[in-house]
């Protein structure tokens, strides 16, 4: 690439070569700059899987890929038999965690991911094609949602048991791979910009650097590296009841997260199941899967069982049940 970018001083270029090489020299930095900019765009991912050891149990993982701090996470699902959507859990980094049946255990895994386990039986249990949605809010930047459902191939009715672990590894590799490519691209863009700045302009093809290039140098790599660092997880387990849910257009989720359809679905409304009794969240754990959580020490603090998992300056009021529509 270096030899292509420079036109030899003593040798005239071949016809058409000058334009082609100059064009490549100018286009490549813009492509890389675009990648760097998009690397900083917040994304939400969702993974739904069924436990191989317990076919009545699902695992849903949600995470936020972005640089902002999370102010609230809401997990919802479409409900059985086409019923209207229902909130399963709400996680606030300071005010605590609230959850409703069939949710059994909601918790933070990292600063940017949560986990939720659902009851394995009961009339309100979700089905294999139930859609789960995770919405991450980062105040005041905004909020982002992604939805997912269990892949059809993992249907418990099938003879072959699901194999979630390889899928998870593949998705993880995809995320890390793309992040790595973006990071490398940004570094390479910096290298190109530095070369354009320090080397003498080619005699036949003067180099033109964009006025926006220095700004890209300043922040794009850090955005990419941040995106590479955020590979969070969240988990949900549930049992299955038949439900027919139509999918609509995606609102978010990394395109490389291919283990399941991420989509947001607009569904016909029916009676929503309003479970008014919150189930206390259990003690927390630190996932060290694949060594991803080296930054576990930065997560919100966890305490033992109870409704409010974080210190609440307002006292016992936080322990009361919901006063409103739930």
């Amino acid at each position: 690439m270096r030899t292509e970018a420079q036109v030899p001083a003593l040798q005239p270029p071949e016809p058409g070569l000058e334009g082609a090489m100059g064009h490549r020299t100018l286009v490549l930095p813009w492509v890389l700059l675009t990648l760097c900019v998009t690397a900083g765009t917040p994304e939400v991912w969702v993974q739904v899987r069924m436990e191989a050891t317990e076919l009545s149990s699902f695992t849903i993982r949600c995470g936020f890929l972005g640089s902002g701090s999370i102010s609230l996470v809401t997990v919802s699902w479409g409900g059985p038999n086409g019923a209207g959507g229902t909130t399963l859990a709400v996680l606030h980094p300071e005010r605590g965690i609230r959850q409703w049946a069939p949710a059994r255990q909601a918790r933070w895994e990292t600063q940017s991911s949560i986990s939720l386990i659902l009851e394995g039986s009961g009339a309100s249990s979700p089905c294999a094609n139930t859609t789960f949605c995770c919405k991450f809010a980062s105040f005041p930047e905004g909020s982002w949602e992604a939805c997912g459902s269990l892949p059809p191939s993992s249907d418990p009715g099938l003879s072959a048991p699901p194999t979630p672990a390889p899928i998870l590894r593949a998705d993880l590799a995809g995320i890390l791979g793309v992040s790595g490519v973006l990071l490398f691209g940004c570094v390479y863009l910096l290298h190109l910009l530095r070369r354009h700045k320090h080397r003498p302009a080619p005699r036949l093809q003067p180099s033109r650097t964009s006025p926006q290039a220095p700004r890209a140098r300043a922040w794009a790599p850090s955005q990419a590296s941040q995106a590479a660092l955020h590979v969070p997880y969240a988990t949900i387990n549930t049992s299955c009841r038949p439900a027919t849910l139509d999918t609509a257009h995606p609102h978010g989720g990394p395109s490389w997260w291919a283990s399941l359809p991420t989509h947001a679905a607009h569904r016909p409304q029916g009676p929503a199941a309003w479970a008014s009794t919150p189930i206390p969240a259990r003690g927390s754990f630190v996932s060290v899967e694949n060594g991803l959580y080296a930054q576990a020490g930065e997560r919100p603090p966890h305490t033992g069982p109870g409704l409010t998992l974080f210190p609440d300056p307002r006292g016992p009021r936080a322990m009361e049940g919901p006063l409103g529509v739930r």
């Epitope: 102010s71 609230l72 996470v73 809401t74 919802s76 699902w77 479409g78 019923a83 209207g84 959507g85 229902t86 909130t87 709400v90 606030h92 005010r95 605590g96 609230r98 859609t131 949605c133 919405k135 809010a137 105040f139 005041p140 905004g142 909020s143 982002w144 949602e145 939805c147 609102h251 978010g252 947001a264 679905a265 607009h266 569904r267 409304q269 029916g270 009676p271 929503a272 309003w274 307002r314 009021r317 936080a318 009361e320 919901p322 006063l323 409103g324 529509v325 739930r326």
Partner: nanobody, 127 residues
Amino acid sequence: EVQLVESGGGLVQPGGSLRLSCAASGFTFSYYDMSWVRQAPGKGLEWVSTINSDGGRTSYVDSVKGRFTISRDNSKNTLYLQMNSLRAEDTAVYYCVEGDPHNFGLENLSLRDFGSWGQGTMVTVSS
């Protein structure tokens, strides 16, 4: 990205009516409880009303009961607040938010306590 855009605010005389709308996009609107909160000049954020995901249940702060009606149209991804018999004390910026503030208590409410929020629409009740 999630977007909530309020409209319908304005200047109205005491006893008058207004209908606020909130257009939602970027998320599965029908899955979430929605609320209206307001902030009067120089005051903190106050919860006004909440409606559940399918519109079957509603609740209101005492000061607006019988005067305000919250509703939603999930087919249009829109939340509404019909405000009748308006009073001077209803003057505030009204925000459309996702979530139920009762989840964590109504004290010291902040927009950061909700899953999504709009930019707000000003309602002024004055003669």
